[in-house]
Protein backbone atom coordinates (compact mmCIF):
# COMPACT_ATOMS: atom_id res chain seq x y z
CA UNK A 1 0.00 0.00 0.00
CA UNK A 2 1.19 3.53 -0.75
CA UNK A 3 2.28 5.60 2.22
CA UNK A 4 0.58 8.92 2.90
CA UNK A 5 2.81 11.57 1.33
CA UNK A 6 3.94 14.75 3.03
CA UNK A 7 5.46 18.01 1.83
CA UNK A 8 8.84 19.29 2.95
CA UNK A 9 9.85 22.88 2.28
CA UNK A 10 13.28 24.49 2.11
CA UNK A 11 11.87 27.80 3.32
CA UNK A 12 8.63 28.19 5.24
CA UNK A 13 8.99 31.99 5.66
CA UNK A 14 10.03 33.24 2.21
CA UNK A 15 10.35 36.94 1.39
CA UNK A 16 8.26 38.29 -1.48
CA UNK A 17 10.10 38.99 -4.76
CA UNK A 18 13.33 37.70 -3.25
CA UNK A 19 13.14 34.04 -2.28
CA UNK A 20 12.53 30.87 -4.23
CA UNK A 21 10.80 28.02 -2.45
CA UNK A 22 11.24 24.33 -3.13
CA UNK A 23 8.44 22.01 -2.07
CA UNK A 24 9.25 18.32 -2.15
CA UNK A 25 6.70 15.52 -2.07
CA UNK A 26 8.01 12.79 0.23
CA UNK A 27 8.77 9.93 0.26
CA UNK A 28 10.42 8.67 -2.90
CA UNK A 29 8.25 5.85 -4.23
CA UNK A 30 8.87 3.57 -7.19
CA UNK A 31 6.44 3.32 -10.11
CA UNK A 32 4.28 6.17 -8.90
CA UNK A 33 3.01 9.41 -10.34
CA UNK A 34 3.34 12.64 -8.37
CA UNK A 35 0.56 15.22 -8.48
CA UNK A 36 0.23 18.75 -7.06
CA UNK A 37 -2.69 20.96 -6.05
CA UNK A 38 -2.65 24.64 -5.16
CA UNK A 39 -5.72 26.16 -3.52
CA UNK A 40 -7.52 22.84 -4.09
CA UNK A 41 -6.96 23.08 -7.83
CA UNK A 42 -4.60 21.17 -10.08
CA UNK A 43 -1.35 22.96 -10.73
CA UNK A 44 -1.65 25.34 -13.67
CA UNK A 45 1.23 26.25 -15.94
CA UNK A 46 3.14 29.37 -14.89
CA UNK A 47 6.59 30.71 -15.71
CA UNK A 48 7.22 31.04 -11.97
CA UNK A 49 6.43 27.38 -11.25
CA UNK A 50 8.83 24.59 -12.09
CA UNK A 51 8.32 20.85 -11.71
CA UNK A 52 11.33 18.55 -11.60
CA UNK A 53 12.46 15.12 -10.47
CA UNK A 54 9.49 13.39 -12.07
CA UNK A 55 7.11 16.05 -10.69
CA UNK A 56 8.20 15.24 -7.15
CA UNK A 57 9.70 18.71 -6.63
CA UNK A 58 7.76 21.92 -7.09
CA UNK A 59 9.81 25.14 -7.21
CA UNK A 60 8.30 28.60 -6.91
CA UNK A 61 10.96 30.73 -8.57
CA UNK A 62 9.98 34.04 -6.97
CA UNK A 63 7.27 34.02 -4.36
CA UNK A 64 4.60 36.66 -4.05
CA UNK A 65 2.10 37.32 -1.27
CA UNK A 66 -0.48 35.42 -3.33
CA UNK A 67 1.55 32.21 -3.16
CA UNK A 68 0.57 31.22 0.37
CA UNK A 69 -1.31 28.14 -0.86
CA UNK A 70 -2.38 25.76 0.58
CA UNK A 71 -0.26 23.22 -1.33
CA UNK A 72 -0.97 19.50 -1.45
CA UNK A 73 0.82 16.70 -3.19
CA UNK A 74 -0.41 13.27 -4.11
CA UNK A 75 1.07 9.97 -5.18
CA UNK A 76 -0.69 7.33 -7.19
CA UNK A 77 -0.02 4.02 -8.85
CA UNK A 78 -2.24 1.53 -10.63
CA UNK A 79 -3.73 0.28 -7.35
CA UNK A 80 -4.25 3.35 -5.14
CA UNK A 81 -3.74 7.04 -4.58
CA UNK A 82 -2.86 9.07 -1.46
CA UNK A 83 -2.89 12.81 -0.80
CA UNK A 84 -0.80 14.82 1.67
CA UNK A 85 -1.99 17.21 4.33
CA UNK A 86 -2.03 20.83 3.11
CA UNK A 87 0.99 23.08 3.63
CA UNK A 88 0.70 26.86 3.76
CA UNK A 89 3.58 29.26 3.14
CA UNK A 90 4.00 32.27 5.39
CA UNK A 91 5.16 34.74 2.75
CA UNK A 92 6.68 37.82 4.34
CA UNK A 93 6.14 40.98 2.36
CA UNK A 94 6.01 44.75 2.53
CA UNK A 95 5.65 47.15 4.03
CA UNK A 96 3.76 48.68 1.12
CA UNK A 97 3.63 52.46 0.79
CA UNK A 98 1.54 53.56 3.75
CA UNK A 99 -1.77 55.38 3.51
CA UNK A 100 -2.64 58.14 5.96
CA UNK A 101 -6.30 58.74 6.67
CA UNK A 102 -8.29 60.89 6.67
CA UNK A 103 -6.95 62.45 3.45
CA UNK A 104 -7.53 66.07 4.54
CA UNK A 105 -4.53 68.40 4.41
CA UNK A 106 -6.14 71.56 5.83
CA UNK A 107 -7.53 71.89 9.34
CA UNK A 108 -9.11 74.63 11.38
CA UNK A 109 -7.37 75.92 14.47
CA UNK A 110 -8.87 74.31 17.58
CA UNK A 111 -9.74 71.05 15.81
CA UNK A 112 -8.41 67.67 16.86
CA UNK A 113 -5.88 66.08 14.52
CA UNK A 114 -6.43 62.35 14.37
CA UNK A 115 -4.30 60.59 11.76
CA UNK A 116 -4.22 56.87 11.16
CA UNK A 117 -1.56 55.14 9.09
CA UNK A 118 -1.95 51.80 7.37
CA UNK A 119 0.49 49.69 5.38
CA UNK A 120 -0.02 46.20 4.03
CA UNK A 121 2.73 44.01 5.44
CA UNK A 122 3.44 40.56 6.86
CA UNK A 123 4.29 40.54 9.66
CA UNK A 124 2.36 43.62 10.75
CA UNK A 125 4.64 46.64 10.32
CA UNK A 126 6.09 48.80 13.03
CA UNK A 127 4.60 52.29 12.77
CA UNK A 128 6.22 55.54 13.81
CA UNK A 129 5.31 59.18 13.30
CA UNK A 130 7.68 62.04 12.66
CA UNK A 131 6.63 65.68 12.62
CA UNK A 132 8.98 68.00 10.74
CA UNK A 133 11.68 65.35 11.00
CA UNK A 134 11.36 64.77 14.75
CA UNK A 135 10.16 61.44 16.09
CA UNK A 136 6.81 61.88 17.81
CA UNK A 137 5.69 58.39 18.78
CA UNK A 138 5.79 54.69 17.90
CA UNK A 139 2.10 54.18 17.15
CA UNK A 140 -0.20 53.56 14.22
CA UNK A 141 -2.47 56.44 15.23
CA UNK A 142 -1.38 60.01 15.89
CA UNK A 143 -3.71 62.19 17.94
CA UNK A 144 -3.15 65.86 18.76
CA UNK A 145 -5.92 67.81 20.45
CA UNK A 146 -6.78 71.44 19.73
CA UNK A 147 -4.23 72.10 17.04
CA UNK A 148 -2.92 75.58 16.24
CA UNK A 149 -0.75 77.04 13.51
CA UNK A 150 2.20 75.71 15.50
CA UNK A 151 1.11 72.27 14.28
CA UNK A 152 1.68 73.14 10.62
CA UNK A 153 4.22 70.93 8.97
CA UNK A 154 5.29 67.66 7.42
CA UNK A 155 3.72 64.62 9.06
CA UNK A 156 5.56 61.44 8.12
CA UNK A 157 4.37 57.91 8.79
CA UNK A 158 7.33 55.55 8.73
CA UNK A 159 6.76 51.80 8.52
CA UNK A 160 9.27 49.04 9.01
CA UNK A 161 9.23 45.26 8.58
CA UNK A 162 12.05 43.51 10.43
CA UNK A 163 11.44 40.25 8.58
CA UNK A 164 11.88 41.63 5.06
CA UNK A 165 14.32 44.29 6.22
CA UNK A 166 12.35 46.88 4.27
CA UNK A 167 11.03 50.33 5.21
CA UNK A 168 8.54 52.66 3.62
CA UNK A 169 7.09 56.05 4.35
CA UNK A 170 4.71 58.77 3.31
CA UNK A 171 4.62 62.47 4.11
CA UNK A 172 1.57 64.70 4.45
CA UNK A 173 2.01 68.46 4.56
CA UNK A 174 -0.66 69.67 6.94
CA UNK A 175 -1.71 73.28 7.33
CA UNK A 176 -3.78 74.74 10.13
CA UNK A 177 -5.80 77.84 9.33
CA UNK A 178 -7.25 80.25 11.87
CA UNK A 179 -10.16 81.18 9.59
CA UNK A 180 -13.42 79.39 8.84
CA UNK A 181 -12.27 77.77 5.61
CA UNK A 182 -13.45 74.22 5.12
CA UNK A 183 -10.93 71.36 5.33
CA UNK A 184 -9.12 70.85 2.04
CA UNK A 185 -9.04 67.65 0.06
CA UNK A 186 -6.04 65.41 0.04
CA UNK A 187 -4.04 67.03 -2.76
CA UNK A 188 -0.74 65.30 -3.28
CA UNK A 189 1.26 63.62 -0.59
CA UNK A 190 4.79 62.46 -1.16
CA UNK A 191 5.66 58.84 -0.65
CA UNK A 192 8.79 56.81 -0.93
CA UNK A 193 10.34 53.47 -0.15
CA UNK A 194 12.73 54.68 2.47
CA UNK A 195 14.84 56.52 -0.11
CA UNK A 196 13.00 59.85 -0.07
CA UNK A 197 13.06 60.11 3.72
CA UNK A 198 16.18 58.17 4.61
CA UNK A 199 18.19 61.31 5.32
CA UNK A 200 15.58 62.46 7.83
CA UNK A 201 15.46 59.07 9.54
CA UNK A 202 19.25 58.69 9.59
CA UNK A 203 19.57 62.13 11.17
CA UNK A 204 17.00 61.19 13.79
CA UNK A 205 18.61 57.89 14.80
CA UNK A 206 19.77 59.05 18.23
CA UNK A 207 16.41 60.61 18.93
CA UNK A 208 14.66 57.53 17.51
CA UNK A 209 16.40 55.28 20.00
CA UNK A 210 16.64 57.40 23.08
CA UNK A 211 14.36 60.43 23.09
CA UNK A 212 10.79 59.30 22.80
CA UNK A 213 8.39 62.25 23.03
CA UNK A 214 4.67 62.23 23.77
Amino acid sequence: ELPKPYISSNNSNPIEDKDAVTLTCEPVAENTTYLWWVNNQSLSVSPRLQLSNGNRILTLLSVTRNDTGPYECGIQNSESAKRSDPVTLNVTYGPDTPIISPPDLSYRSGANLNLSCHSDSNPSPQYSWLINGTLRQHTQVLFISKITSNNNGAYACFVSNLATGRNNSIVKNISVSSGDSAPGSSGLSASGSGSGLNDIFEAQKIEWHHHHHH
Epitope: P123, S124, Q126, Y127, S128, Q137, T139, Q140, F143
Partner: antibody
Framework: EVQLVESGGGLVKPGGSLKLSCAAS????????MSWVRQTPEKRLEWVAF????????YYADTVKGRFTISRDNAKNTLYLQMSSLKSEDTAMFYC?????????????WGQGTLVTVSA | DIQMTQSPASLSASVGETVTITCRAS??????FAWYQQKQGKSPQLLVY???ILAEGVPSRFSGSGSGTQFSLKINSLQPEDFGTYYC?????????FGSGTKLELK
Protein backbone atom coordinates in the same frame (compact mmCIF):
# COMPACT_ATOMS: atom_id res chain seq x y z
CA GLU B 1 5.09 61.42 33.12
CA VAL B 2 3.49 58.24 31.77
CA GLN B 3 1.22 56.60 34.34
CA LEU B 4 -0.92 53.48 34.17
CA VAL B 5 -2.87 52.71 37.35
CA GLU B 6 -4.75 49.41 37.64
CA SER B 7 -7.62 48.78 40.04
CA GLY B 8 -10.42 46.30 40.64
CA GLY B 9 -8.42 43.31 41.82
CA GLY B 10 -9.38 41.30 44.89
CA LEU B 11 -10.41 37.93 46.25
CA VAL B 12 -13.06 36.07 44.26
CA LYS B 13 -14.46 32.55 44.39
CA PRO B 14 -14.00 30.10 41.49
CA GLY B 15 -16.68 30.74 38.87
CA GLY B 16 -16.96 34.37 39.94
CA SER B 17 -16.42 37.58 37.99
CA LEU B 18 -14.27 40.66 38.34
CA LYS B 19 -13.70 43.80 36.27
CA LEU B 20 -10.26 45.38 36.19
CA SER B 21 -9.64 48.99 35.18
CA CYS B 22 -6.49 50.76 34.07
CA ALA B 23 -6.43 54.58 34.17
CA ALA B 24 -3.89 56.16 31.83
CA SER B 25 -2.29 59.60 32.01
CA UNK B 26 0.79 61.42 30.75
CA UNK B 27 0.50 60.17 27.17
CA UNK B 28 -1.98 60.09 24.30
CA UNK B 29 -3.85 56.98 25.40
CA UNK B 30 -6.12 56.86 22.33
CA UNK B 31 -3.07 56.44 20.05
CA UNK B 32 -1.73 53.36 21.77
CA UNK B 33 -2.61 49.71 21.38
CA MET B 34 -2.92 48.14 24.84
CA SER B 35 -2.59 44.72 26.47
CA TRP B 36 -3.19 43.02 29.77
CA VAL B 37 -0.31 40.88 31.02
CA ARG B 38 -0.40 38.78 34.18
CA GLN B 39 2.27 37.41 36.48
CA THR B 40 1.58 34.13 38.20
CA PRO B 41 2.57 33.39 41.82
CA GLU B 42 5.52 31.45 40.31
CA LYS B 43 6.59 34.77 38.68
CA ARG B 44 5.88 33.67 35.11
CA LEU B 45 4.69 36.43 32.79
CA GLU B 46 1.73 35.64 30.53
CA TRP B 47 0.15 37.85 27.91
CA VAL B 48 -3.66 37.86 28.39
CA ALA B 49 -5.40 40.16 25.89
CA PHE B 50 -4.77 42.90 23.32
CA UNK B 51 -6.89 45.78 22.01
CA UNK B 52 -6.06 48.18 19.19
CA UNK B 53 -6.06 51.94 19.70
CA UNK B 54 -9.70 52.41 18.73
CA UNK B 55 -10.92 49.03 19.91
CA UNK B 56 -11.53 47.57 16.47
CA UNK B 57 -9.27 44.58 16.99
CA UNK B 58 -9.09 42.38 20.08
CA TYR B 59 -7.07 39.21 20.66
CA TYR B 60 -6.94 36.80 23.59
CA ALA B 61 -4.68 34.09 24.96
CA ASP B 62 -6.20 30.63 24.48
CA THR B 63 -6.36 30.19 28.27
CA VAL B 64 -8.84 33.08 28.69
CA LYS B 65 -10.73 33.05 25.37
CA GLY B 66 -14.49 33.12 25.93
CA ARG B 67 -14.09 34.10 29.60
CA PHE B 68 -12.31 37.47 29.48
CA THR B 69 -13.24 40.60 27.51
CA ILE B 70 -10.90 43.52 26.90
CA SER B 71 -12.35 46.95 26.15
CA ARG B 72 -11.40 50.61 26.36
CA ASP B 73 -12.97 54.04 26.73
CA ASN B 74 -10.70 56.58 25.06
CA ALA B 75 -12.81 59.49 26.30
CA LYS B 76 -12.02 58.36 29.86
CA ASN B 77 -8.44 57.23 29.10
CA THR B 78 -9.30 53.87 30.62
CA LEU B 79 -8.67 50.24 29.70
CA TYR B 80 -10.82 47.42 31.08
CA LEU B 81 -10.67 43.66 31.52
CA GLN B 82 -13.95 41.90 32.32
CA MET B 83 -13.19 38.48 33.77
CA SER B 84 -15.82 35.78 34.28
CA SER B 85 -15.84 32.04 35.06
CA LEU B 86 -12.67 32.62 37.02
CA LYS B 87 -10.46 29.65 37.90
CA SER B 88 -7.82 29.18 40.56
CA GLU B 89 -5.16 29.26 37.83
CA ASP B 90 -6.20 32.85 37.04
CA THR B 91 -4.68 33.94 40.35
CA ALA B 92 -2.04 36.50 39.38
CA MET B 93 -0.89 40.07 39.44
CA PHE B 94 -2.54 41.76 36.43
CA TYR B 95 -0.72 44.55 34.62
CA CYS B 96 -1.94 46.80 31.86
CA UNK B 97 0.69 47.72 29.29
CA UNK B 98 0.96 50.11 26.34
CA UNK B 99 2.61 48.92 23.15
CA UNK B 100 5.12 50.46 20.87
CA UNK B 101 4.15 49.64 17.26
CA UNK B 102 1.07 47.49 17.99
CA UNK B 103 1.05 43.75 17.41
CA UNK B 104 4.69 43.78 16.31
CA UNK B 105 5.94 45.82 19.24
CA UNK B 106 7.01 45.40 22.86
CA UNK B 107 5.27 46.52 26.04
CA UNK B 108 6.70 50.02 26.42
CA UNK B 109 4.85 51.17 29.54
CA TRP B 110 3.49 49.11 32.44
CA GLY B 111 1.17 49.83 35.34
CA GLN B 112 1.97 48.87 38.93
CA GLY B 113 -0.44 45.92 38.84
CA THR B 114 -3.57 44.77 40.65
CA LEU B 115 -3.72 41.42 42.42
CA VAL B 116 -6.45 38.92 41.57
CA THR B 117 -6.85 35.94 43.88
CA VAL B 118 -9.26 33.15 42.93
CA SER B 119 -9.88 30.87 45.89
CA ALA B 120 -12.74 29.07 47.59
CA ASP C 1 2.89 29.19 19.83
CA ILE C 2 6.49 30.38 19.93
CA GLN C 3 8.35 29.14 23.03
CA MET C 4 11.06 31.25 24.65
CA THR C 5 13.78 29.35 26.53
CA GLN C 6 15.81 31.55 28.84
CA SER C 7 19.06 30.72 30.64
CA PRO C 8 20.39 30.67 33.22
CA ALA C 9 17.46 30.58 35.66
CA SER C 10 19.59 32.38 38.25
CA LEU C 11 22.94 34.08 38.31
CA SER C 12 25.14 35.46 41.09
CA ALA C 13 27.52 38.28 40.30
CA SER C 14 29.36 41.14 41.97
CA VAL C 15 29.20 44.86 41.32
CA GLY C 16 31.56 45.72 38.46
CA GLU C 17 31.30 42.32 36.79
CA THR C 18 29.98 41.68 33.28
CA VAL C 19 27.15 39.17 32.83
CA THR C 20 25.30 37.73 29.84
CA ILE C 21 21.80 36.26 29.76
CA THR C 22 20.60 34.27 26.75
CA CYS C 23 17.25 33.41 25.26
CA ARG C 24 16.28 31.02 22.48
CA ALA C 25 13.10 31.17 20.41
CA SER C 26 11.51 27.97 19.13
CA UNK C 27 11.27 29.48 15.65
CA UNK C 28 12.62 32.39 13.65
CA UNK C 29 11.39 35.67 15.13
CA UNK C 30 13.83 37.88 13.18
CA UNK C 31 14.50 40.84 15.50
CA UNK C 32 11.05 41.01 17.10
CA PHE C 33 12.50 40.51 20.53
CA ALA C 34 12.59 42.40 23.83
CA TRP C 35 14.22 42.29 27.25
CA TYR C 36 12.59 43.50 30.49
CA GLN C 37 13.92 44.13 33.98
CA GLN C 38 11.79 43.61 37.06
CA LYS C 39 12.79 44.59 40.57
CA GLN C 40 11.23 43.11 43.69
CA GLY C 41 7.68 44.36 44.19
CA LYS C 42 7.72 46.43 41.00
CA SER C 43 6.35 46.00 37.49
CA PRO C 44 8.57 44.95 34.57
CA GLN C 45 10.31 47.73 32.65
CA LEU C 46 11.30 47.65 28.99
CA LEU C 47 15.08 47.55 28.50
CA VAL C 48 15.61 46.52 24.89
CA TYR C 49 13.34 46.08 21.88
CA UNK C 50 13.89 45.07 18.25
CA UNK C 51 16.65 42.85 19.72
CA UNK C 52 19.16 45.67 20.15
CA ILE C 53 17.52 49.08 20.58
CA LEU C 54 17.80 50.44 24.11
CA ALA C 55 14.55 51.84 25.49
CA GLU C 56 14.44 55.42 26.65
CA GLY C 57 16.56 56.09 29.72
CA VAL C 58 18.33 52.71 29.72
CA PRO C 59 22.05 53.04 30.52
CA SER C 60 24.54 52.17 27.78
CA ARG C 61 26.09 49.40 29.90
CA PHE C 62 23.13 47.30 28.71
CA SER C 63 23.32 45.86 25.20
CA GLY C 64 21.14 43.44 23.30
CA SER C 65 22.18 41.29 20.38
CA GLY C 66 21.00 38.43 18.20
CA SER C 67 18.40 37.69 15.56
CA GLY C 68 16.48 34.71 14.30
CA THR C 69 16.33 32.33 17.24
CA GLN C 70 19.30 33.24 19.48
CA PHE C 71 19.43 36.39 21.58
CA SER C 72 21.48 37.73 24.44
CA LEU C 73 21.55 40.59 26.92
CA LYS C 74 24.92 41.77 28.15
CA ILE C 75 25.37 44.01 31.19
CA ASN C 76 28.80 45.56 31.51
CA SER C 77 30.13 46.73 34.86
CA LEU C 78 27.15 45.72 36.98
CA GLN C 79 25.71 48.42 39.22
CA PRO C 80 23.77 47.82 42.48
CA GLU C 81 20.51 48.87 40.78
CA ASP C 82 20.91 46.17 38.09
CA PHE C 83 20.04 43.28 40.40
CA GLY C 84 16.59 41.82 39.85
CA THR C 85 14.87 39.49 37.41
CA TYR C 86 15.22 39.73 33.63
CA TYR C 87 12.67 38.41 31.16
CA CYS C 88 12.88 37.93 27.42
CA UNK C 89 9.86 38.18 25.14
CA UNK C 90 9.08 37.91 21.46
CA UNK C 91 6.94 40.60 19.85
CA UNK C 92 6.59 38.79 16.53
CA UNK C 93 2.80 38.99 16.66
CA UNK C 94 0.17 37.35 18.83
CA UNK C 95 0.33 35.43 21.11
CA UNK C 96 3.24 37.16 22.81
CA UNK C 97 5.27 34.83 25.01
CA PHE C 98 7.93 35.39 27.66
CA GLY C 99 10.93 33.49 28.89
CA SER C 100 10.77 32.07 32.41
CA GLY C 101 13.12 34.72 33.79
CA THR C 102 16.69 35.02 35.05
CA LYS C 103 17.17 36.11 38.63
CA LEU C 104 20.35 38.17 38.93
CA GLU C 105 21.54 38.21 42.53
CA LEU C 106 24.35 39.92 44.36
CA LYS C 107 27.19 37.51 45.11
Amino acid sequence: EVQLVESGGGLVKPGGSLKLSCAASGFTFSSYDMSWVRQTPEKRLEWVAFISSYGGRTYYADTVKGRFTISRDNAKNTLYLQMSSLKSEDTAMFYCAAHYFGTSGPFAYWGQGTLVTVSA
Amino acid sequence: DIQMTQSPASLSASVGETVTITCRASENIYSYFAWYQQKQGKSPQLLVYNAKILAEGVPSRFSGSGSGTQFSLKINSLQPEDFGTYYCQHHYGIPFTFGSGTKLELK
